[in-house]
Amino acid sequence: RPSFSLVEDTTLEPEEPPTKYQISQPEVYVAAPGESLEVRCLLKDAAVISWTKDGVHLGPNNRTVLIGEYLQIKGATPRDSGLYACTASRTVDSETWYFMVNVTDAISSGDDEDDTDGAEDFVSENSNNKRAPYWTNTEKMEKRLHAVPAANTVKFRCPAGGNPMPTMRWLKNGKEFKQEHRIGGYKVRNQHWSLIMESVVPSDKGNYTCVVENEYGSINHTYHLDVVERSPHRPILQAGLPANASTVVGGDVEFVCKVYSDAQPHIQWIKHVEKNGSKYGPDGLPYLKVLKHSGINSSNAEVLALFNVTEADAGEYICKVSNYIGQANQSAWLTVLPKQQAPGREKEITASPDYLE
Protein backbone atom coordinates (compact mmCIF):
# COMPACT_ATOMS: atom_id res chain seq x y z
CA ARG A 1 0.00 0.00 0.00
CA PRO A 2 1.19 3.58 -0.54
CA SER A 3 3.26 5.08 2.24
CA PHE A 4 1.24 8.29 2.21
CA SER A 5 -2.23 9.61 1.44
CA LEU A 6 -2.52 12.30 -1.20
CA VAL A 7 -4.79 15.17 -0.28
CA GLU A 8 -5.71 15.77 -3.90
CA ASP A 9 -5.52 13.83 -7.14
CA THR A 10 -2.15 14.53 -8.66
CA THR A 11 -2.35 12.77 -11.99
CA LEU A 12 0.92 13.27 -13.84
CA GLU A 13 -0.67 13.26 -17.27
CA PRO A 14 -0.19 14.69 -19.73
CA GLU A 15 3.56 14.90 -19.32
CA GLU A 16 5.53 17.57 -21.14
CA PRO A 17 7.39 16.46 -24.26
CA PRO A 18 10.52 15.29 -22.46
CA THR A 19 13.96 16.66 -23.01
CA LYS A 20 17.28 15.03 -22.27
CA TYR A 21 17.97 15.94 -18.67
CA GLN A 22 21.23 17.71 -18.02
CA ILE A 23 21.01 19.45 -14.72
CA SER A 24 23.89 20.96 -12.74
CA GLN A 25 26.64 19.87 -15.10
CA PRO A 26 29.64 19.13 -12.87
CA GLU A 27 33.32 19.27 -13.78
CA VAL A 28 34.44 16.21 -15.76
CA TYR A 29 37.69 14.33 -15.16
CA VAL A 30 38.68 12.00 -17.98
CA ALA A 31 41.01 9.05 -17.66
CA ALA A 32 41.91 6.13 -19.88
CA PRO A 33 41.44 2.62 -18.51
CA GLY A 34 44.48 1.52 -16.53
CA GLU A 35 45.54 5.04 -15.70
CA SER A 36 45.58 6.47 -12.19
CA LEU A 37 43.41 9.44 -11.37
CA GLU A 38 43.79 11.91 -8.53
CA VAL A 39 41.14 14.47 -7.66
CA ARG A 40 41.34 17.09 -4.96
CA CYS A 41 38.15 18.06 -3.15
CA LEU A 42 37.76 21.74 -3.96
CA LEU A 43 36.26 22.75 -0.64
CA LYS A 44 37.91 24.99 1.92
CA ASP A 45 38.37 24.46 5.65
CA ALA A 46 37.14 20.89 5.67
CA ALA A 47 37.32 19.22 9.04
CA VAL A 48 35.96 15.92 7.79
CA ILE A 49 35.56 14.89 4.16
CA SER A 50 33.28 12.08 3.03
CA TRP A 51 33.05 10.78 -0.52
CA THR A 52 30.22 9.25 -2.57
CA LYS A 53 29.96 7.74 -6.03
CA ASP A 54 26.55 7.76 -7.72
CA GLY A 55 25.04 8.55 -4.34
CA VAL A 56 26.63 5.62 -2.54
CA HIS A 57 29.25 6.04 0.20
CA LEU A 58 32.77 5.51 -1.11
CA GLY A 59 35.31 3.86 1.15
CA PRO A 60 38.95 2.96 0.63
CA ASN A 61 39.80 -0.32 -1.09
CA ASN A 62 42.72 -1.82 -2.98
CA ARG A 63 42.23 0.64 -5.87
CA THR A 64 40.66 3.63 -4.10
CA VAL A 65 42.78 5.69 -1.74
CA LEU A 66 41.30 8.51 0.34
CA ILE A 67 43.91 10.78 1.90
CA GLY A 68 42.78 14.10 3.33
CA GLU A 69 41.14 16.08 0.56
CA TYR A 70 42.47 13.75 -2.17
CA LEU A 71 40.77 10.86 -3.90
CA GLN A 72 43.05 8.52 -5.82
CA ILE A 73 41.81 5.80 -8.15
CA LYS A 74 44.49 3.37 -9.24
CA GLY A 75 44.17 1.43 -12.49
CA ALA A 76 40.89 3.07 -13.47
CA THR A 77 38.25 1.07 -15.33
CA PRO A 78 34.99 2.24 -16.96
CA ARG A 79 33.23 0.93 -13.83
CA ASP A 80 34.82 3.87 -12.02
CA SER A 81 32.90 6.29 -14.25
CA GLY A 82 30.10 8.14 -12.52
CA LEU A 83 29.01 11.10 -10.46
CA TYR A 84 31.31 11.67 -7.48
CA ALA A 85 30.86 14.02 -4.57
CA CYS A 86 32.95 15.13 -1.65
CA THR A 87 31.17 16.57 1.36
CA ALA A 88 33.06 18.74 3.81
CA SER A 89 31.54 18.66 7.27
CA ARG A 90 32.44 21.65 9.41
CA THR A 91 31.41 22.61 12.91
CA VAL A 92 28.57 24.84 11.71
CA ASP A 93 27.65 23.60 8.26
CA SER A 94 28.47 21.24 5.42
CA GLU A 95 29.14 21.72 1.72
CA THR A 96 29.25 19.35 -1.22
CA TRP A 97 31.25 19.54 -4.44
CA TYR A 98 30.36 17.39 -7.42
CA PHE A 99 32.43 16.11 -10.31
CA MET A 100 32.13 13.48 -13.01
CA VAL A 101 34.69 10.80 -13.74
CA ASN A 102 34.69 9.39 -17.26
CA VAL A 103 36.97 6.43 -17.83
CA THR A 104 36.79 5.54 -21.49
CA ASP A 105 39.05 4.44 -24.28
CA ALA A 106 37.10 4.28 -27.53
CA ILE A 107 40.13 3.11 -29.46
CA SER A 108 42.21 1.08 -27.09
CA SER A 109 45.98 0.60 -27.00
CA GLY A 110 46.97 4.21 -27.04
CA ASP A 111 46.81 5.47 -30.60
CA ASP A 112 44.47 6.51 -33.35
CA GLU A 113 42.49 4.05 -35.36
CA ASP A 114 44.06 5.22 -38.58
CA ASP A 115 47.50 4.19 -37.40
CA THR A 116 49.13 7.12 -39.16
CA ASP A 117 52.31 6.52 -37.21
CA GLY A 118 52.19 2.78 -37.63
CA ALA A 119 54.69 2.54 -40.45
CA GLU A 120 57.54 3.37 -38.12
CA ASP A 121 56.80 0.16 -36.23
CA PHE A 122 57.62 -1.87 -39.32
CA VAL A 123 61.40 -2.09 -38.95
CA SER A 124 63.57 -3.03 -41.92
CA GLU A 125 66.72 -4.98 -41.01
CA ASN A 126 70.00 -5.34 -42.87
CA SER A 127 69.68 -8.73 -44.54
CA ASN A 128 73.01 -9.90 -43.06
CA ASN A 129 72.06 -9.26 -39.44
CA LYS A 130 69.92 -12.26 -38.55
CA ARG A 131 67.94 -11.48 -35.44
CA ALA A 132 65.25 -13.07 -33.31
CA PRO A 133 62.02 -11.05 -32.85
CA TYR A 134 62.10 -8.12 -30.47
CA TRP A 135 59.66 -5.40 -29.43
CA THR A 136 60.18 -2.05 -31.13
CA ASN A 137 57.77 0.09 -29.10
CA THR A 138 57.18 -1.25 -25.61
CA GLU A 139 55.45 2.00 -24.57
CA LYS A 140 52.46 1.00 -26.68
CA MET A 141 52.31 -2.32 -24.87
CA GLU A 142 52.54 -1.18 -21.27
CA LYS A 143 48.83 -1.14 -20.62
CA ARG A 144 47.88 -4.80 -20.30
CA LEU A 145 44.39 -4.41 -18.86
CA HIS A 146 41.88 -2.85 -21.25
CA ALA A 147 38.46 -2.21 -19.75
CA VAL A 148 36.26 -0.99 -22.57
CA PRO A 149 32.56 -0.11 -22.71
CA ALA A 150 30.43 -2.46 -24.80
CA ALA A 151 30.04 -1.46 -28.46
CA ASN A 152 33.42 0.30 -28.57
CA THR A 153 36.35 -0.63 -30.79
CA VAL A 154 39.45 -2.23 -29.30
CA LYS A 155 42.93 -2.33 -30.78
CA PHE A 156 45.82 -4.34 -29.40
CA ARG A 157 49.32 -3.70 -30.75
CA CYS A 158 52.57 -5.61 -30.61
CA PRO A 159 55.06 -3.58 -32.67
CA ALA A 160 58.04 -5.84 -33.39
CA GLY A 161 61.14 -6.28 -35.49
CA GLY A 162 63.49 -9.08 -36.42
CA ASN A 163 65.33 -10.59 -39.36
CA PRO A 164 63.85 -12.21 -41.24
CA MET A 165 60.71 -10.13 -40.63
CA PRO A 166 58.66 -12.00 -38.01
CA THR A 167 55.12 -13.15 -38.51
CA MET A 168 52.36 -12.36 -36.04
CA ARG A 169 49.44 -14.50 -34.92
CA TRP A 170 46.86 -14.03 -32.18
CA LEU A 171 45.52 -16.32 -29.47
CA LYS A 172 42.41 -15.86 -27.38
CA ASN A 173 42.64 -17.46 -23.95
CA GLY A 174 45.64 -19.46 -25.15
CA LYS A 175 43.96 -20.90 -28.23
CA GLU A 176 44.11 -19.91 -31.89
CA PHE A 177 41.84 -16.91 -32.46
CA LYS A 178 39.71 -17.54 -35.52
CA GLN A 179 37.49 -15.11 -37.41
CA GLU A 180 34.44 -17.24 -36.69
CA HIS A 181 35.05 -16.93 -32.95
CA ARG A 182 33.26 -13.58 -32.91
CA ILE A 183 30.37 -12.07 -34.82
CA GLY A 184 31.83 -9.60 -37.28
CA GLY A 185 35.24 -11.21 -37.03
CA TYR A 186 38.28 -9.02 -36.49
CA LYS A 187 41.00 -7.25 -38.45
CA VAL A 188 44.71 -7.89 -38.32
CA ARG A 189 46.93 -5.16 -39.74
CA ASN A 190 50.27 -6.87 -40.07
CA GLN A 191 52.12 -3.74 -41.13
CA HIS A 192 50.95 -2.10 -37.90
CA TRP A 193 51.24 -5.22 -35.74
CA SER A 194 47.66 -4.74 -34.61
CA LEU A 195 44.48 -6.66 -33.87
CA ILE A 196 41.25 -4.66 -34.15
CA MET A 197 37.85 -5.76 -32.85
CA GLU A 198 34.89 -3.51 -33.56
CA SER A 199 31.77 -3.21 -31.45
CA VAL A 200 32.92 -5.42 -28.60
CA VAL A 201 30.42 -7.46 -26.58
CA PRO A 202 30.78 -9.31 -23.25
CA SER A 203 31.71 -12.57 -25.00
CA ASP A 204 34.88 -10.81 -26.22
CA LYS A 205 36.23 -10.69 -22.66
CA GLY A 206 39.42 -12.63 -22.16
CA ASN A 207 43.17 -12.78 -22.69
CA TYR A 208 44.57 -11.89 -26.12
CA THR A 209 48.13 -12.95 -26.85
CA CYS A 210 50.18 -11.83 -29.80
CA VAL A 211 52.82 -14.37 -30.82
CA VAL A 212 55.60 -12.88 -32.95
CA GLU A 213 58.07 -15.36 -34.38
CA ASN A 214 60.69 -16.08 -36.98
CA GLU A 215 63.14 -18.93 -37.42
CA TYR A 216 65.40 -17.46 -34.74
CA GLY A 217 62.89 -17.15 -31.95
CA SER A 218 59.48 -16.30 -30.65
CA ILE A 219 58.15 -13.63 -28.28
CA ASN A 220 54.65 -13.04 -26.99
CA HIS A 221 52.65 -10.47 -25.09
CA THR A 222 49.23 -10.84 -23.46
CA TYR A 223 46.50 -8.24 -23.05
CA HIS A 224 43.41 -8.70 -20.91
CA LEU A 225 40.15 -7.33 -22.26
CA ASP A 226 37.21 -6.58 -19.98
CA VAL A 227 34.00 -5.45 -21.66
CA VAL A 228 31.98 -3.25 -19.34
CA GLU A 229 28.26 -2.90 -19.84
CA ARG A 230 26.44 0.24 -18.85
CA SER A 231 23.02 -0.18 -17.38
CA PRO A 232 20.33 2.38 -16.68
CA HIS A 233 20.11 3.56 -13.09
CA ARG A 234 17.71 5.23 -10.74
CA PRO A 235 17.86 9.00 -10.26
CA ILE A 236 20.62 10.40 -8.07
CA LEU A 237 20.04 13.57 -6.08
CA GLN A 238 22.78 15.98 -5.07
CA ALA A 239 23.56 15.53 -1.40
CA GLY A 240 22.50 18.40 0.86
CA LEU A 241 19.81 19.61 -1.50
CA PRO A 242 17.22 20.83 -1.00
CA ALA A 243 18.78 22.79 1.86
CA ASN A 244 16.98 23.91 5.00
CA ALA A 245 15.85 27.52 4.76
CA SER A 246 14.28 30.19 6.91
CA THR A 247 12.46 33.39 6.06
CA VAL A 248 10.15 35.90 7.70
CA VAL A 249 6.41 36.01 7.19
CA GLY A 250 5.79 37.63 3.80
CA GLY A 251 9.21 36.66 2.51
CA ASP A 252 10.15 34.52 -0.48
CA VAL A 253 12.15 31.33 -0.48
CA GLU A 254 13.51 28.83 -3.00
CA PHE A 255 14.24 25.13 -2.62
CA VAL A 256 16.52 23.52 -5.21
CA CYS A 257 16.77 19.83 -6.05
CA LYS A 258 19.56 18.81 -8.42
CA VAL A 259 19.00 15.60 -10.34
CA TYR A 260 21.30 13.21 -12.16
CA SER A 261 19.37 10.75 -14.33
CA ASP A 262 20.08 9.21 -17.71
CA ALA A 263 16.44 8.14 -18.15
CA GLN A 264 13.74 10.83 -18.20
CA PRO A 265 13.09 11.90 -14.58
CA HIS A 266 9.72 12.94 -13.19
CA ILE A 267 10.13 15.48 -10.40
CA GLN A 268 7.60 16.16 -7.65
CA TRP A 269 7.67 18.64 -4.78
CA ILE A 270 5.61 17.34 -1.89
CA LYS A 271 4.66 18.80 1.49
CA HIS A 272 3.24 17.23 4.63
CA VAL A 273 -0.14 18.86 5.27
CA GLU A 274 -3.06 18.62 7.65
CA LYS A 275 -6.58 17.59 6.74
CA ASN A 276 -9.42 18.13 9.17
CA GLY A 277 -6.84 19.00 11.81
CA SER A 278 -4.94 15.75 11.37
CA LYS A 279 -1.57 15.05 9.79
CA TYR A 280 -2.42 11.39 9.24
CA GLY A 281 -5.20 9.56 7.47
CA PRO A 282 -7.33 6.76 8.94
CA ASP A 283 -4.76 4.28 7.64
CA GLY A 284 -2.02 5.93 9.68
CA LEU A 285 -0.27 7.34 6.63
CA PRO A 286 0.72 11.00 6.46
CA TYR A 287 -1.23 13.41 4.29
CA LEU A 288 0.92 14.80 1.51
CA LYS A 289 0.21 17.44 -1.10
CA VAL A 290 1.99 17.65 -4.44
CA LEU A 291 2.91 21.31 -4.88
CA LYS A 292 4.64 21.04 -8.23
CA HIS A 293 5.63 18.37 -10.70
CA SER A 294 7.39 18.20 -14.03
CA GLY A 295 4.67 18.59 -16.62
CA ILE A 296 3.13 20.82 -19.24
CA ASN A 297 2.39 23.78 -16.99
CA SER A 298 5.55 23.47 -14.96
CA SER A 299 8.63 25.57 -15.53
CA ASN A 300 12.01 24.61 -14.06
CA ALA A 301 10.86 21.62 -11.99
CA GLU A 302 14.07 21.35 -9.96
CA VAL A 303 13.25 24.65 -8.25
CA LEU A 304 10.33 25.19 -5.90
CA ALA A 305 9.73 28.90 -5.28
CA LEU A 306 7.47 30.05 -2.46
CA PHE A 307 6.34 33.67 -2.40
CA ASN A 308 4.81 35.75 0.39
CA VAL A 309 5.06 32.86 2.82
CA THR A 310 2.87 32.47 5.86
CA GLU A 311 3.42 30.50 9.04
CA ALA A 312 1.32 27.74 7.50
CA ASP A 313 4.05 27.22 4.90
CA ALA A 314 6.53 26.10 7.54
CA GLY A 315 7.40 22.43 7.54
CA GLU A 316 9.08 19.70 5.55
CA TYR A 317 9.37 19.89 1.75
CA ILE A 318 10.23 16.73 -0.17
CA CYS A 319 11.86 16.57 -3.58
CA LYS A 320 10.87 13.23 -5.04
CA VAL A 321 12.33 12.09 -8.36
CA SER A 322 11.35 9.01 -10.30
CA ASN A 323 12.32 7.43 -13.58
CA TYR A 324 11.11 4.14 -15.02
CA ILE A 325 13.77 2.26 -13.07
CA GLY A 326 13.38 3.65 -9.57
CA GLN A 327 13.09 6.60 -7.23
CA ALA A 328 15.05 8.89 -4.94
CA ASN A 329 13.90 11.57 -2.53
CA GLN A 330 15.36 14.12 -0.16
CA SER A 331 13.76 16.76 2.00
CA ALA A 332 14.38 20.10 3.69
CA TRP A 333 12.67 22.17 6.34
CA LEU A 334 11.30 25.68 6.04
CA THR A 335 11.28 27.79 9.17
CA VAL A 336 9.02 30.85 9.05
CA LEU A 337 10.00 33.57 11.50
CA PRO A 338 7.87 36.42 12.83
CA LYS A 339 8.40 39.71 10.99
CA GLN A 340 10.60 41.30 13.65
CA GLN A 341 13.25 38.57 13.37
CA ALA A 342 15.85 38.93 10.66
CA PRO A 343 15.86 36.03 8.18
CA GLY A 344 18.99 33.97 7.66
CA ARG A 345 19.88 31.16 5.35
CA GLU A 346 20.02 28.09 7.55
CA LYS A 347 22.69 25.58 6.64
CA GLU A 348 22.87 22.51 8.77
CA ILE A 349 25.11 19.49 8.72
CA THR A 350 23.11 17.10 6.62
CA ALA A 351 22.92 13.45 7.37
CA SER A 352 23.44 10.91 4.62
CA PRO A 353 20.94 11.63 1.85
CA ASP A 354 17.84 9.50 1.76
CA TYR A 355 18.75 7.42 -1.27
CA LEU A 356 16.27 4.64 -1.71
CA GLU A 357 18.85 1.95 -2.34
Epitope: R1, P2, S3, F4, L12, E13, P14, E15, E16, P17, P18, T19, K20, Y21, S231, P232, R234, D262, A263, Q264, H266, S322, N323, Y324, I325, G326, Q327, L356, E357
Partner: antibody
Protein backbone atom coordinates in the same frame (compact mmCIF):
# COMPACT_ATOMS: atom_id res chain seq x y z
CA UNK B 1 20.40 -14.90 -11.57
CA UNK B 2 17.47 -12.50 -11.85
CA UNK B 3 14.08 -14.21 -12.14
CA UNK B 4 10.50 -13.02 -12.26
CA UNK B 5 8.17 -15.99 -11.85
CA UNK B 6 4.47 -15.44 -12.51
CA UNK B 7 1.43 -17.42 -11.41
CA UNK B 8 -0.27 -19.88 -13.71
CA UNK B 9 -2.92 -19.45 -16.42
CA UNK B 10 -6.44 -18.41 -15.42
CA UNK B 11 -9.85 -18.84 -17.02
CA UNK B 12 -12.47 -16.35 -15.84
CA UNK B 13 -16.05 -15.39 -16.64
CA UNK B 14 -17.00 -11.87 -17.74
CA UNK B 15 -17.52 -9.60 -14.74
CA UNK B 16 -15.16 -11.59 -12.51
CA UNK B 17 -11.73 -10.52 -11.22
CA UNK B 18 -8.30 -12.06 -11.66
CA UNK B 19 -5.18 -11.62 -9.54
CA UNK B 20 -1.78 -12.41 -11.06
CA UNK B 21 1.36 -12.70 -8.92
CA UNK B 22 4.98 -12.05 -9.83
CA UNK B 23 7.74 -13.30 -7.50
CA UNK B 24 11.13 -11.62 -7.88
CA UNK B 25 14.50 -13.09 -6.99
CA UNK B 26 18.14 -12.33 -7.71
CA UNK B 27 17.93 -8.57 -7.20
CA UNK B 28 16.70 -6.04 -4.65
CA UNK B 29 12.95 -6.14 -5.20
CA UNK B 30 12.23 -2.87 -3.38
CA UNK B 31 14.65 -0.77 -5.44
CA UNK B 32 12.97 -0.97 -8.83
CA UNK B 33 9.54 -0.25 -10.26
CA UNK B 34 7.54 -3.34 -11.16
CA UNK B 35 5.66 -2.68 -14.37
CA UNK B 36 2.75 -4.65 -15.78
CA UNK B 37 2.32 -5.05 -19.52
CA UNK B 38 -0.31 -7.04 -21.37
CA UNK B 39 -0.59 -8.49 -24.86
CA UNK B 40 -3.87 -9.59 -26.42
CA UNK B 41 -3.68 -12.50 -28.90
CA UNK B 42 -1.96 -11.39 -32.09
CA UNK B 43 -1.72 -7.83 -30.80
CA UNK B 44 0.97 -5.51 -29.53
CA UNK B 45 2.18 -4.64 -26.03
CA UNK B 46 0.26 -2.35 -23.69
CA UNK B 47 1.57 -0.82 -20.45
CA UNK B 48 -0.96 -1.07 -17.62
CA UNK B 49 0.82 0.50 -14.69
CA UNK B 50 3.65 0.15 -12.19
CA UNK B 51 4.23 -0.11 -8.46
CA UNK B 52 7.33 0.96 -6.53
CA UNK B 53 7.73 -1.79 -3.93
CA UNK B 54 9.65 0.23 -1.36
CA UNK B 55 6.87 2.70 -0.65
CA UNK B 56 3.88 1.43 -2.61
CA UNK B 57 3.79 4.34 -5.06
CA UNK B 58 1.68 3.51 -8.07
CA UNK B 59 1.29 4.90 -11.58
CA UNK B 60 -1.64 3.66 -13.63
CA UNK B 61 -2.44 3.89 -17.30
CA UNK B 62 -5.65 5.93 -17.19
CA UNK B 63 -7.24 3.39 -19.53
CA UNK B 64 -7.21 0.86 -16.68
CA UNK B 65 -7.69 3.18 -13.70
CA UNK B 66 -10.53 1.93 -11.54
CA UNK B 67 -10.25 -1.65 -12.84
CA UNK B 68 -6.65 -2.50 -12.08
CA UNK B 69 -5.14 -2.70 -8.59
CA UNK B 70 -1.42 -3.09 -8.06
CA UNK B 71 -0.09 -4.31 -4.71
CA UNK B 72 3.06 -5.89 -3.36
CA UNK B 73 4.31 -7.92 -0.42
CA UNK B 74 7.92 -6.96 0.22
CA UNK B 75 8.40 -9.76 2.76
CA UNK B 76 8.13 -12.30 -0.06
CA UNK B 77 9.37 -10.06 -2.91
CA UNK B 78 6.11 -10.47 -4.79
CA UNK B 79 4.01 -8.02 -6.80
CA UNK B 80 0.36 -8.50 -7.68
CA UNK B 81 -1.89 -7.20 -10.41
CA UNK B 82 -5.64 -7.53 -9.98
CA UNK B 83 -7.99 -6.72 -12.85
CA UNK B 84 -11.70 -6.49 -12.07
CA UNK B 85 -14.91 -6.39 -14.11
CA UNK B 86 -13.30 -8.59 -16.72
CA UNK B 87 -14.45 -8.43 -20.33
CA UNK B 88 -13.72 -10.73 -23.23
CA UNK B 89 -11.22 -8.22 -24.63
CA UNK B 90 -9.16 -8.60 -21.45
CA UNK B 91 -8.12 -12.01 -22.75
CA UNK B 92 -4.36 -11.61 -22.98
CA UNK B 93 -0.96 -12.60 -21.69
CA UNK B 94 -0.02 -10.45 -18.69
CA UNK B 95 3.67 -9.77 -18.01
CA UNK B 96 5.49 -8.25 -15.07
CA UNK B 97 8.74 -6.47 -15.89
CA UNK B 98 11.36 -4.54 -13.97
CA UNK B 99 14.01 -2.16 -15.36
CA UNK B 100 12.89 -3.10 -18.86
CA UNK B 101 15.33 -6.01 -18.99
CA UNK B 102 13.80 -8.39 -16.45
CA UNK B 103 10.55 -10.03 -17.59
CA UNK B 104 8.27 -12.68 -16.17
CA UNK B 105 7.28 -15.62 -18.35
CA UNK B 106 3.75 -14.28 -18.75
CA UNK B 107 0.37 -15.36 -17.38
CA UNK B 108 -2.41 -16.19 -19.82
CA UNK B 109 -5.82 -14.89 -18.72
CA UNK B 110 -8.79 -16.10 -20.73
CA UNK B 111 -12.15 -14.40 -20.26
CA UNK B 112 -14.98 -16.48 -21.63
CA UNK B 113 -18.59 -17.16 -20.77
CA UNK C 1 -0.36 9.79 -24.50
CA UNK C 2 2.61 9.71 -26.85
CA UNK C 3 1.90 7.53 -29.87
CA UNK C 4 4.66 5.48 -31.45
CA UNK C 5 4.29 4.43 -35.08
CA UNK C 6 6.62 1.78 -36.46
CA UNK C 7 7.39 1.23 -40.10
CA UNK C 8 7.20 -1.03 -41.85
CA UNK C 9 4.55 -3.14 -40.10
CA UNK C 10 6.03 -6.24 -41.67
CA UNK C 11 9.19 -6.96 -43.57
CA UNK C 12 10.64 -9.89 -45.50
CA UNK C 13 14.40 -10.24 -45.62
CA UNK C 14 17.14 -12.81 -46.09
CA UNK C 15 19.96 -13.98 -43.87
CA UNK C 16 22.85 -11.54 -44.24
CA UNK C 17 20.65 -8.58 -45.14
CA UNK C 18 20.91 -5.22 -43.43
CA UNK C 19 17.54 -4.28 -41.97
CA UNK C 20 16.27 -0.95 -40.62
CA UNK C 21 13.08 -0.42 -38.61
CA UNK C 22 11.92 3.08 -37.79
CA UNK C 23 9.79 4.40 -34.95
CA UNK C 24 8.11 7.79 -35.13
CA UNK C 25 6.84 9.51 -31.98
CA UNK C 26 3.93 11.94 -31.83
CA UNK C 27 5.97 14.16 -29.46
CA UNK C 28 9.69 14.63 -28.95
CA UNK C 29 11.41 12.05 -26.76
CA UNK C 30 14.76 11.85 -25.03
CA UNK C 31 15.19 8.12 -25.40
CA UNK C 32 13.81 5.00 -27.03
CA UNK C 33 13.98 1.32 -26.10
CA UNK C 34 13.71 -1.59 -28.51
CA UNK C 35 12.50 -5.13 -27.83
CA UNK C 36 12.51 -8.39 -29.73
CA UNK C 37 9.68 -10.87 -29.21
CA UNK C 38 9.34 -14.41 -30.46
CA UNK C 39 6.03 -16.32 -30.44
CA UNK C 40 5.05 -17.54 -27.00
CA UNK C 41 7.94 -15.73 -25.30
CA UNK C 42 8.30 -12.56 -23.25
CA UNK C 43 9.85 -9.54 -24.97
CA UNK C 44 13.63 -9.26 -24.77
CA UNK C 45 15.34 -5.89 -24.34
CA UNK C 46 17.73 -5.13 -27.21
CA UNK C 47 18.47 -1.42 -26.91
CA UNK C 48 17.86 1.07 -24.09
CA UNK C 49 18.39 4.83 -23.96
CA UNK C 50 18.23 4.96 -27.78
CA UNK C 51 21.63 3.45 -28.53
CA UNK C 52 22.87 1.35 -25.62
CA UNK C 53 23.11 -2.37 -26.26
CA UNK C 54 21.45 -4.45 -23.54
CA UNK C 55 23.37 -7.22 -21.82
CA UNK C 56 24.00 -10.27 -23.98
CA UNK C 57 22.69 -8.68 -27.20
CA UNK C 58 24.85 -9.24 -30.30
CA UNK C 59 26.61 -6.19 -31.70
CA UNK C 60 24.84 -6.51 -35.04
CA UNK C 61 21.93 -4.70 -33.34
CA UNK C 62 22.21 -0.94 -33.02
CA UNK C 63 19.90 1.96 -32.26
CA UNK C 64 19.98 5.63 -33.11
CA UNK C 65 17.79 8.71 -33.40
CA UNK C 66 16.52 11.67 -31.42
CA UNK C 67 13.43 13.81 -31.04
CA UNK C 68 10.63 12.10 -32.91
CA UNK C 69 12.53 9.71 -35.18
CA UNK C 70 14.34 6.61 -33.98
CA UNK C 71 15.86 3.63 -35.77
CA UNK C 72 16.76 0.03 -35.00
CA UNK C 73 19.32 -1.50 -37.39
CA UNK C 74 20.37 -5.12 -37.76
CA UNK C 75 23.62 -5.06 -39.72
CA UNK C 76 23.58 -8.66 -40.93
CA UNK C 77 20.47 -10.74 -40.32
CA UNK C 78 20.94 -14.10 -38.66
CA UNK C 79 18.36 -16.93 -38.69
CA UNK C 80 17.51 -16.30 -35.02
CA UNK C 81 16.63 -12.64 -35.71
CA UNK C 82 13.30 -13.41 -37.38
CA UNK C 83 10.80 -12.13 -34.82
CA UNK C 84 8.60 -9.14 -34.00
CA UNK C 85 10.28 -5.91 -32.91
CA UNK C 86 8.73 -3.19 -30.73
CA UNK C 87 9.87 0.31 -29.86
CA UNK C 88 8.91 1.74 -26.49
CA UNK C 89 9.16 5.09 -24.72
CA UNK C 90 9.79 5.29 -20.98
CA UNK C 91 9.77 9.09 -20.91
CA UNK C 92 6.15 10.12 -20.46
CA UNK C 93 3.13 8.57 -18.76
CA UNK C 94 1.46 6.43 -19.89
CA UNK C 95 4.45 4.52 -21.22
CA UNK C 96 3.69 3.32 -24.73
CA UNK C 97 4.85 0.80 -27.32
CA UNK C 98 4.87 0.88 -31.10
CA UNK C 99 2.48 -1.50 -32.86
CA UNK C 100 5.33 -3.83 -33.79
CA UNK C 101 7.26 -4.82 -36.92
CA UNK C 102 7.16 -8.46 -37.94
CA UNK C 103 10.40 -9.55 -39.57
CA UNK C 104 9.91 -12.63 -41.72
CA UNK C 105 12.25 -14.82 -43.72
CA UNK C 106 12.17 -14.20 -47.47
Amino acid sequence: EVQLVQSGAEVKKPGASVKVSCKASGYTFTNYWMHWVRQAPGQGLEWMGAIYPENGDINYNQKFKGRVTLTRDTSISTAYMELSRLRSDDTAVYYCTSRGDYWGQGTTVTVSS
Amino acid sequence: AIQLTQSPSSLSASVGDRVTITCSASSGLSYMSWYQQKPGKAPKLLIYDTSNLASGVPSRFSGSGSGTDFTLTISSLQPEDFATYYCQQWSSYPYTFGQGTKLEIK
